[in-house]
């Protein structure tokens, strides 16, 4: 019963333009916009796509970025997207969580390219690795893709048992690890017994 996908690119950041922004080509649009055509509807000027967003041509990407392997890429960071490591988070996990900030698996010789916070993935957007996500988020698997999810806060369940898993693929829903200053520990009940449920607690 499990849907299991892989998705390595991020959501486009496009909004419909207001009236008066119809276009026939990219040249008809102001700087920072491109002409977006739909199958059955008129074309309009749409906001350019930031780093890591999908593209079919460089005109779609914001100034300072180009379209490389279907992804808007900073001019100084144009290595192929398929060459990028994915933090080794595609296997099975004992606790179904993903490390925060999970940078330790980056291979040698491939330094992280620092991106501006505005280009970082938001909650629910797809990602390659945690460094693609904004502050307080990690890159974790959900169904068929890896998306930016919030790191766990104090009191939140951090054990895999907190989510209904299936026999076919118990690890398709990854959680982030506990946030900074927190650790995943068994909850102590009122009668001092340790419950099976593990939650994020202050270190």
């Amino acid at each position: 019963l499990v849907l299991d996908f892989n998705n390595i690119k991020s959501s486009a950041d496009v909004q419909g333009a207001g009236k008066g922004s119809l276009c026939a080509s990219d040249r008809d649009c102001s700087e920072g916009k491109f002409c977006l055509a739909f199958h059955d509807e008129r074309s309009f000027c749409a906001t350019c796509r930031r780093v890591r967003r999908r593209c079919q041509r460089s005109a779609v990407c914001c100034p300072g970025t180009v379209c490389v392997n279907d992804v808007c890429t900073a001019v100084e960071d144009t290595r192929p997207v398929m060459d990028r490591n994915t933090d080794g988070q595609d296997g099975a996990y004992a606790e179904g969580t993903t490390k925060w900030p999970a940078e330790e698996n980056r291979p040698q010789g491939k330094p992280s390219t620092k991106k501006s916070q505005s280009s970082k993935g938001q909650e629910g957007e797809s990602c390659l690795r945690t460094s693609d996500c904004g502050p307080g988020l990690c890159c974790a698997r959900h169904f068929w893709t890896k998306i930016c999810k919030p790191v766990l806060r104090e009191g939140q369940v951090c054990s895999r048992r907190g989510h209904k898993d299936t026999a076919q693929a118990p690890e398709i829903f990854q959680r982030c690890d506990c946030g900074p200053g927190l650790t995943c520990r068994s909850q102590v009940t009122s009668n001092r017994q340790h419950s099976r449920l593990r939650v994020c607690q202050r270190i």
Epitope: D4, F5, K9, S126, H142, P150
Partner: antibody
Framework: EVQLVESGGGLVQPGGSLRLSCAAS????????ISWVRQAPGKGLEWVAS??????????YYPDSVKGRFTISRDNAKNSLYLQMNSLRAEDTAVYYC???????????WGQGTTVTVSS | EIVLTQSPATLSLSPGERATLSCRAS??????????INWYQQKPGQAPRLLIY???KQGSGIPARFSGSGSGTDFTLTISSLEPEDFAVYYC?????????FGGGTKVEIK
């Protein structure tokens, strides 16, 4: 431009077999998961099968309603997705769409569909 | 499995009016701080088109008049001012748990 084009639909008798194809272009096919979703005449949408992309090992998944009867597969060299449908039933009559997730985790690109009719 | 119930089944409105479509889940579709609900538009003879994902985020190239809201079990798709091309069937979908499921749809028709 991302394009998904389905083919292979047609009329088949109950118990028969049919193989659907989906030709993809405009994106790096092997990197992405791709699915089949169907829609019976006048009805809603139903997920049928999925195969993950290279990063998750091309794993395949099915709902109970088609498990054991349908097989999803992909030929990355040909940028093609397939759905082998065996032991077809009247309730499998539907428009079959292939759909993929390129920009977020939902189905954000769809083909136009191919019609499968199971009738005697 | 999670059952999604959409209401109303049919909504009769005029261009320029505001459309409010509801999707109710049989159990919460929130997890990891995210609402795993998506909205699709389908016109006759066409494939569905993604409008909203993660409850409130717009899909690529979707006009700003489409917005999503809600959490837990109750979600709403709002079309702020109906354009002639917006008359179609709208489906919600949950992606919190397996199997992924769709609602039965709401038809927005011209009054």
């Amino acid at each position: 431009e991302v394009q998904l084009v389905e083919s292979g639909g047609g009329l088949v008798q109950p118990g028969g077999s049919l193989r659907l194809s989906c030709a993809a272009s405009g994106f790096t096919f092997s990197s992405y998961a791709i699915s089949w979703v169907r829609q019976a005449p006048g009805k809603g949408l139903e997920w049928v099968a999925s195969v993950s992309g290279t990063g998750l090992g091309f794993q395949t998944y099915y709902p109970d309603s088609v498990k054991g009867r349908f097989t999803i597969s992909r030929d990355n060299a040909k940028n093609s997705l397939y759905l082998q449908m065996n032991s077809l039933r009247a309730e499998d009559t539907a428009v079959y769409y292939c759909a993929t997730s390129l920009e977020n985790y939902a189905f954000d690109y769809w083909g136009q569909g191919t019609t499968v009719t199971v009738s005697s | 499995e999670i059952v999604l119930t959409q209401s109303p089944a049919t909504l009769s409105l005029s261009p320029g009016e505001r459309a409010t479509l509801s999707c109710r889940a049989s159990e919460s579709v929130d997890d990891f701080g995210i609402s795993f609900i998506n909205w699709y538009q389908q016109k006759p003879g066409q494939a569905p088109r993604l409008l909203i994902y993660a409850g409130s985020k717009q899909g690529s190239g979707i006009p700003a008049r489409f917005s999503g809201s809600g959490s837990g079990t109750d979600f709403t798709l709002t079309i702020s001012s109906l354009e002639p091309e917006d008359f179609a069937v709208y489906y919600c979908q949950q992606l919190k748990e397996v199997p992924p499921t769709f609602g039965g749809g709401t038809k927005v028709e011209i009054k």
